[in-house]
């Protein structure tokens, strides 16, 4: 019961996490800037992985996609790749984990197969979560680096003077969504891996029985079998085969349905 709950909860947490990673990847608010000291209009600029947007005080918003791949910073490309890898791995993990759920019966799938699938999906969720966290962290680092590099940077370009505008910058909402979503996916993956241990079938019950026939310690009496089964004269169930039949665990546990020997 606890295993099923752990597995189910892991699946749900991972599902929420992956939905969050997808949402963060699609969001435009990865970085946000307020542009001040503007004589025309107050402008709010925000950028995502796929496009850059400008919203004016009038409410007008214009977004432009990053149509070129070559002109984009390598770091942005890396973040895109990490987020996409995270989504793909997460999606595959979800697909695998659906079939691995203990509460879902598919044909005559054995517990060992379900355990393996649960572990596989768990590992996929962990990697997916790590990809998302890494992607968001790389982007955040890029923002901080750009901020310090651009401080008081003024130079003369070919077409006149170019001056970096110092704006108050904040991490966009997408960064926080990405961090939380990555964390949830990671937690969900760990839960799936924990559930896998409980799902794995226990060691075989066909335990080897070793008979140690040491002359002085074993007394072979007629009716010994009867005594051992409780049908003969030995009604008090005294140990007759004192040093005799022992399991490898020293003492055999309660009989199970597999104990044919």
């Amino acid at each position: 019961m606890a295993v099923t709950a752990c597995q189910g909860l892991g699946f749900v947490v991972s599902l929420i996490g992956i939905a969050g990673i997808i949402a963060a990847t699609c969001m435009d608010q990865w970085s946000t800037q307020d542009l001040y000291n503007n004589p025309v209009t107050a402008v709010f600029n925000y950028q995502g992985l796929w496009r850059s947007c400008v919203r004016e005080s009038s409410g007008f918003t214009e977004c432009r996609g990053y149509f070129t791949l070559l002109g984009l910073p390598a770091m942005l490309q890396a973040v895109r790749a990490l987020m996409i890898v995270g989504i793909v791995l997460g999606a595959i993990g979800l697909l695998v984990s659906i079939f691995a759920l203990k509460c879902i019966r598919i044909g005559s799938m054995e517990d060992s197969a379900k355990a393996n699938m649960t572990l596989t999906s768990g590992i996929m969720f962990i990697v997916s979560g790590l990809c998302a966290i890494a992607g968001v962290s790389v982007f955040a680092n890029m923002l901080v680096t750009n901020f310090w590099m651009s401080t008081a940077n003024m130079y003369t370009g070919m077409g006149g003077m170019v001056q970096t505008v110092q704006t108050r910058y904040t991490f966009g909402a997408a960064l926080f969504v990405g961090w939380v979503a990555g964390g949830l996916t990671l937690i969900g993956g760990v839960m799936m891996c924990i559930a896998c241990r409980g799902l794995a079938p226990e060691e075989t019950n066909y335990k080897a029985v070793s008979y140690h026939a040491s002359g002085h310690s074993v007394a072979y009496k007629p009716g010994g079998f009867k005594a051992s089964t409780g049908f003969g004269s030995n009604t008090k169930n005294k140990k007759i085969y004192d040093g005799g039949a022992r399991t490898e665990d020293e003492v055999q546990s309660y009989p199970s349905k597999h104990d044919y020997v």
């Epitope: 209009t41 918003t61 890029m142």
Partner: nanobody, 119 residues
Framework: QVQLQESGGGLVQPGGSLRLSCAAS????????MGWYRQAPGKQRELVAG???????NYGDSVKGRFTISRDNAKNTVYLQMNSLKPEDTAVYYC??????????????WGQGTLVTVS
């Protein structure tokens, strides 16, 4: 790197017209604001007109009703139509653009200026 290419300046008689244009090129994500400033000899640089992406405009007091600013967002170009020119409009006209040129990078770029002489 962002470059500005200004054109349209020259000599014109009082009451005449001129059309200035300024095209931005290079690493550009967005251009929230484009505008024109001018600086007459011995005077401070002043705003002539500015226009936002959405078409919000702002004009300097001395040019209201005579000058019209417009822009082509697709071409990253701003235009200044100057009508009823006066001798006091003589100045070097500078193109000014606010460019989002990268992630968390906003540049204010100034053109080299084009001379307008009303005489």
């Amino acid at each position: 790197q962002v470059q500005l290419q200004e054109s349209g300046g020259g000599l014109v008689q009082p009451g005449g017209s001129l059309r200035l244009s300024c095209a931005a090129s290079g690493s550009i994500f967005n251009i929230p604001v484009m505008g024109w400033y001018r600086q007459a000899p011995g005077k401070q640089r002043e705003l002539v007109a500015g226009i936002s992406t959405g078409g919000t405009t702002n004009y300097g007091d001395s040019v209201k009703g005579r000058f019209t600013i417009s822009r082509d967002n697709a071409k990253n170009t701003v235009y200044l139509q100057m009508n009823s020119l006066k001798p006091e409009d003589t100045a070097v006209y500078y193109c000014n653009v606010l460019v989002v040129s990268g992630i968390g990078s906003t540049l204010e770029v100034w053109g080299q200026g084009t001379l307008v002489t009303v005489s």
